[in-house]
């Protein structure tokens, strides 16, 4: 999906209002500095691409992030403010439903959510403070 035509201001508002709080709750007891940055993004569409990938694509040691509250709200936000986004996600959602539920917060998941927080922070800053 090409995130170029999303309403970035609305997505930012949703992030600040709800998604950020859910991410921080997930990370509670863990400092973001416990994990080095292993993923970055270079503009707002790119940030959303990487956020979508980390949030919804299961990885070997962290398969269940898509069921978390922040993930559900991220999905709803993207569906609301990115034209045509929800249509592209139907197949992915059906595939996700077939997976077994496993409610374990592994260190790998904490690391992944730490990276997500970093990506969202980059998304909400409109520009580097100077240059």
């Amino acid at each position: 999906y090409d995130f170029t035509n999303c309403d970035f201001q609305k997505i930012e508002a949703d992030y600040l209002r709800t998604i950020s709080k859910d991410l921080i709750t997930y990370m509670s007891g863990t400092k973001s500095t416990d994990f080095n940055n292993t993923v970055s993004c270079s503009n707002r569409p790119h940030c959303l691409t990487e956020i979508q990938s980390l949030t919804f694509n299961p990885t070997p040691r962290c398969a269940s992030l898509a069921k978390e509250m922040f993930a559900r709200k991220t999905k709803a936000t993207l569906a609301l403010w990115c034209p045509g986004y929800s249509e592209t996600q139907i197949n992915a959602t059906q595939a996700m439903k077939k997976r077994r539920k496993r409610k374990v917060t592994t260190n790998k998941c904490l690391e992944q959510v730490s990276q997500l927080l970093g990506l969202w922070r980059r998304f909400i800053r409109t520009l580097l403070k100077k240059q």
Partner: antibody, heavy 122, light 108 residues
Framework: QMQLVESGGGVVQPGRSLRLSCAAS????????MHWVRQAPGKGLEWVAV????????HYADSVKGRFTITRDNSKNTLNLQMNSLRAEDTAVYYC???????????????WGQGTMVTVSS | SYVLTQPPSVSVAPGQTARITCGGN??????VHWYQQKPGQAPVLVVY???DRPSWIPERFSGSNSGNTATLTISRGEAGDEADYYC???????????FGGGTKLTVL
């Protein structure tokens, strides 16, 4: 852990070519801008070139423009520097480094390789 | 092209504060990054975006930037701080990375 490992250095005669490589691991390579920086013996750091996170664009120091080419292969997590028409003044340790990028601005270089030595001598 | 000027050397007594400067035209309008390099080793980022510090760098390292001068401050200097220090900026007008000439810090 996050790592950059350079290879390909060696001794080469003036006017000849050499290709350096940098293997990245432990981070999502395709999301970072990548640089080459060199350091001549006993001298300071000299920036050589940078390539965008997606390979879309490149920038070069005037001292290497037209002779060196920076490329990346995001499918293999590798960065390359093709060095042609080498001169004695290109003798240096060559480091690769990563930096986050925002639009067309490159930020700090937060991870560096250990360097590979290139000696240009007849 | 853009030029960054650093003093070739700075000395500090153990436990005292070292200040290393980096000068450039209207430097305060750019984000300055600082690197530490010990002999035979690769550079290490110690301060980025003027005053931010990577999680692995001690709080003794701090930075500031305004006008035409950026400053790296190392408080409570230790023997292990002996190294070369380089400032760096991205020059948007020319799409080039610029390094200062480097400053050798000696802990007396």
């Amino acid at each position: 852990q996050m790592q950059l490992v350079e290879s390909g250095g060696g001794v080469v005669q003036p006017g000849r070519s050499l290709r350096l490589s940098c293997a990245a691991s432990g981070f999502t390579f395709r999301t970072y801008g990548m640089h080459w920086v060199r350091q001549a013996p006993g001298k300071g750091l000299e920036w050589v070139a940078v390539v965008w996170y997606d390979g879309y664009d490149t920038h070069y120091a005037d001292s290497v423009k037209g002779r060196f080419t920076i490329t990346r292969d995001n499918s293999k997590n590798t960065l390359n520097l093709q060095m042609n028409s080498l001169r004695a003044e290109d003798t240096a340790v060559y480091y690769c480094s990563r930096s986050p990028q925002w639009e067309d601005i490159f930020e700090s270089m937060d991870i560096w390789g250990q360097g590979t030595m290139v000696t240009v001598s007849s | 092209s853009y030029v960054l000027t650093q003093p070739p050397s700075v000395s500090v007594a153990p436990g005292q504060t070292a200040r290393i400067t980096c000068g450039g035209n209207n430097l305060g309008s750019k984000s300055v990054h600082w690197y530490q390099q010990k002999p035979g080793q690769a550079p290490v980022l110690v301060v980025y975006d003027d005053s931010d510090r990577p999680s692995w760098i001690p709080e003794r390292f701090s930075g500031s930037n305004s006008g035409n001068t950026a400053t790296l401050t190392i408080s409570r200097g230790e023997a292990g701080d002996e190294a070369d220090y380089y400032c760096q900026v991205w020059d948007m007008s020319s799409d080039l990375v610029v390094f200062g000439g480097g400053t050798k810090l000696t802990v007396l």
